[in-house]
Amino acid sequence: QQQTLPKPFIWAEPHFMVPKEKQVTICCQGNYGAVEYQLHFEGSLFAVDRPKPPERINKVQFYIPDMNSRMAGQYSCIYRVGELWSEPSNLLDLVVTEMYDTPTLSVHPGPEVISGEKVTFYCRLDTATSMFLLLKEGRSSHVQRGYGKVQAEFPLGPVTTAHRGTYRCFGSYNNHAWSFPSEPVKLLVTGDIENTSLAPEDPTFPADTWGTYLLTTETGLQKDHALWDHTAQNLLR
């Protein structure tokens, strides 16, 4: 006899990285017929929704109108059908960004390189932080973590045309509080013509969408949870 229901999906819209004082919605998708959803924050009950009519609703949304460091952390949700509760969802790490300062991102030997060259990114931030994150804009969550007193280096090794794209970095004050993003650095990797034309390149978002941090996923992927890329989420753990 089944003791628990399948775990729900949890995600954040527009993104799990939220600039401070901006809004975010935490979505929890369970099953049609669920009479109650609970959102938990850092292990404690945060909010409750009892959708009506339950048989017509399989997703609830928890709205955070004003993101701040108190609201950043790990969220999970559960739902109930009758008296039977679900397994808890995976943990959603909600990150507040635009805290304190802006790091500087540079690349060596430069932003235009030849396929096979060794490339290293440097992220520098003079305020008190020792953890840095390098993100590549695009469809997947290409995130690297680096450490250093005021600067971290991110060696990409010998690059291919797949490394082409726009990069930014953050200083991290803790796992869930990040700095402003650095200015973007666009890496251009040239190779022979056949390689270049066939190289897969992550679609990059226009600069003005960065403000909403739609940098690591397309809306379609975000809605199709089976395809949701958890690289960045897992990295936070």
Epitope: L45, A47, Q61, F62, Y63
Partner: nanobody
């Protein structure tokens, strides 16, 4: 933006009853979910009860379940907390809070969920 003013606190004997009221300013009261919290001297603020914006969902702390009832009158821009069978451990300053969820059926349990707060009203349960 909504302003909240609590009333109805006072001194009551154990086993007695009190009804707290929280009046909200503005014409958008029905778009807010409401909650009651309390803070006893030297303790952290704790959740008591909450009600969704249409009144269809209520939620209570285990410590008050069966004794306290939360209700609202959207025509009067007021939320109520009926407190029966009061105990000395119910002594605290009671705060009303409001927030705007995306659904009619949602309530907040954590204080961080709420955007707006009243100044509080003192309830003392003592013989």
């Amino acid at each position: 933006q909504v302003q909240l003013v609590e009333s109805g606190g006072g001194l009551v004997q154990p086993g007695g009853s009190l009804r707290l009221a929280c009046a909200a300013s503005g014409r958008t009261f029905s778009t807010y979910a409401m909650g009651w919290f309390r803070q006893a001297p030297g303790k952290e603020r704790e959740f008591v009860a909450a009600i969704s914006r249409n009144g269809g969902t209520t939620y209570y702390a285990d410590s008050v379940k069966g004794r306290f009832t939360i209700s609202r009158d959207n025509a009067k821009n007021t939320v109520y907390l009926q407190m029966n069978s009061l105990k000395p451990e119910d002594t605290a300053v009671y705060y009303c809070a409001a927030s705007r969820p995306l659904s009619n059926t949602q309530v907040g349990v954590a204080s961080a969920w709420y955007e707006f707060w009243g100044q509080g009203t003192l309830v003392t349960v003592s013989s």
